[in-house]
């Protein structure tokens, strides 16, 4: 066979679908790899060919499009399963070709089983809702293209195992689920099941997502440095270990990059010669507010080190702040014998 541009196995597109449900899978060539769409390719006389490799096999084989009730079919650049079976799991390849041109890409498809409460190995998308922020909605995802607009599906929403009904602040509204006032108690997995008829058969689409209630932008503040502060003085003798924690609280902000860093005499620790290490730990509140702690450590501090300026800096989308640590050299206590002698008026 002549040369074919092989884009390999596109593991970025790890497609997971539920067993016994319809699935429509677009050939990734037109979405990620080629600069033209299927219509252009088709008009130019290119043919789209599908084949697959079963799970735990090496042999590529053509897809059987002659199954009863057209269980697997192709429509333009979409491979359809109506519905999927567990043993459809494997690597699927779509190849676009004519006598002079060839391009192909493979992608993994995993058919997943769910339990009676919709739990499964499926990787769930996370939808963040702001706490006590007014009405917010989530929409049943990835159901476009399964049925024409003339078909009116029924949609049932579940939280975990239970149909959503008579919830105080959560209201199913067709494809949308409305949260009147999102609270921490609304955290969890939400499932919509879309039921629609097609050619005398009933199909179901199950979609689960995780709702995480996070801090509201109404309550967001610039970073707050809890430590260092004016109440704590780091008093050390030369040779001792100097440990200064920088503890910063960040309000949750969607897509904000939270940063904490130290400067020593106005320079980043990496840019100076002293032997300094910095360890960072991060913790989150229930609403994903973040507390970052960076501990600056100098194992054997020198007199020179104790004269330097140690400043903790923090930045988020809400602003930038800085706070200097109070560092000083401990004055040695007078020696006991000298002190006594002075006390008795000895010269």
């Amino acid at each position: 066979s002549e040369r074919c541009d092989d884009w390999g196995l596109d593991t970025m597109r790890q497609i997971q679908v539920f067993e016994d449900e319809p699935a429509r899978i677009k050939c990734p060539l037109f979405e990620h790899f080629l600069k033209f769409n299927y219509s252009t390719a088709h008009s130019a006389g290119l043919t789209l060919i599908w084949y697959w490799t079963r799970q735990d096999r090496d042999l590529e084989e053509p897809i059987n499009f002659r199954l009863p009730e057209n269980r697997i079919s192709k429509e333009k650049d979409v491979l359809w399963f109506r519905p999927t079976l567990l043993n459809d799991t494997g690597n699927y390849t779509c190849m676009l070709r004519n006598t002079t041109y060839c391009s192909k890409v493979a992608f993994p498809l995993e058919v997943v089983q769910k339990d009676s409460c919709f739990n499964s190995p499926m990787k769930l998308p996370v939808h963040k809702l702001y706490i006590e922020y007014g009405i917010q909605r989530i929409t049943c995802p990835n159901v476009d293209g399964y049925f024409p607009s003339s078909v009116k599906p029924t949609i049932t929403w579940y939280m975990g195992c239970y149909k959503i009904q008579n919830f105080n602040n959560v209201i199913p509204e067709g494809m949308n689920l409305s949260f009147l006032i999102a609270l921490i108690s609304n955290n969890g997995n939400y499932t919509c099941v879309v039921t629609y008829p097609e050619n005398g058969r009933t199909f179901h689409l199950t979609r689960t997502l995780t709702v995480k209630v996070v801090g509201s932008p109404k309550n967001a503040v610039p970073p707050v440095i809890h430590s260092p502060n004016d109440h704590v003085v780091y008093e050390k003798e030369p040779g001792e270990e100097l440990l200064i924690p920088c503890t910063v609280y960040f309000s949750f902000l969607m897509d904000s990059r939270n940063e904490v860093w130290w400067t020593i005499d106005g320079k980043k620790p990496d840019d100076i010669t002293i032997d300094v290490t910095i360890n960072e730990s991060i913790s989150h509140s229930r609403t994903e507010d973040e507390t970052r702690t960076q501990i600056l450590s100098i194992k054997k501090v020198t007199s020179e080190d104790l004269k330097r300026s140690y400043v903790c800096h923090a930045r988020s989308a809400k602003g930038e702040v800085a706070k200097a640590a109070k560092v000083k050299q401990k004055v040695p206590a007078p020696r006991y014998t000298v002190e006594l002698a002075c006390g008795f008026g000895a010269t």
Epitope: F18, E19, D20, P83, L85, L86, Q113, K114, D115, S116, C117, T154, T156, K163, Q165, N166, V193, T195, T202, H204
Partner: antibody, heavy 117, light 107 residues
């Protein structure tokens, strides 16, 4: 297409047990609920319980709790309903009914169980 | 358990007539209501799910409506093959419960 084929009619003595089977085909047995519903002669429908063969989860109507056991054999795509301590008022047609969610989309042909001394 | 009350218990209508059957739940069931058709000596068949969703393959003369506690099954133009008993069933809260049935006959 979905088919549910139930076992044949049974005549049982009071106090004994009956086990009715329901063999499923045409869909993925482990992905749907299997319900059991009964209908006494000339009467309405009465839901007894259900099983999700995928994980074995069961729910029973309080009325039958302790007397009914619903099981499923994934290897043969067969569901079973066993009713014990039979009495004359258990004489009825017993149906299995499959549903991906809660509605019972497809039903078996029914099994007549007669309880008589 | 939720009680489902159907009315009328039986009715007789002519071919082509519009037929309406009602079902009342003892408490709100949030549209979680199915309608089944059972012909003499046969197993029930699902007609309508979730109050108004027509099951695959069911003729469009059947329709369902309602909300809360009151629901209706309508046959827009009665056909001879519609002779059957019709049952409503709630699936809001376990255990699922059925109405007593409405027997539809042709005059």
């Amino acid at each position: 297409q979905v088919q549910l084929v139930q076992s044949g009619a049974e005549v049982k003595k009071p106090g004994s047990s009956v086990k009715v089977s329901c063999k499923a085909s045409g869909y993925t047995f482990t992905s749907s609920w299997m319900n059991w519903v009964r209908q006494a002669p000339g009467k309405g429908l009465e839901w007894m319980g259900r099983i999700y063969p995928g994980d074995g989860q069961t729910h029973y109507a309080q009325k039958f709790q302790g007397r009914v056991t619903i099981t499923a054999d994934k290897s043969t795509s067969t569901a079973y309903m066993e009713l014990s301590s039979l009495r004359s008022e258990d004489t009825a047609v017993y149906y299995c009914g499959e549903g991906y969610l809660d509605p019972m989309d497809y039903w078996g042909q029914g099994t007549l169980v007669t309880v008589s001394s | 358990d939720i009680q489902m009350t159907q009315s009328p218990s039986s009715l007789s209508a002519s071919v082509g007539d519009r037929v309406t059957i009602t079902c009342q739940a003892s408490q709100g069931i949030n549209n979680y209501l199915n309608w089944y058709q059972q012909k003499p000596g046969k197993a029930p068949k699902l007609l309508i799910h979730y109050t108004s969703g027509l099951h695959a393959g069911v003729p469009s003369r059947f329709s369902g409506s309602g909300s809360g506690t009151d629901f209706t099954l309508t046959i827009s133009s009665l056909e001879p093959e519609d002779v059957a008993t019709y049952y409503c069933q709630q699936y809001s809260i376990l255990p699922w419960t059925f109405g007593g049935g409405t027997k539809v006959e042709i005059k």
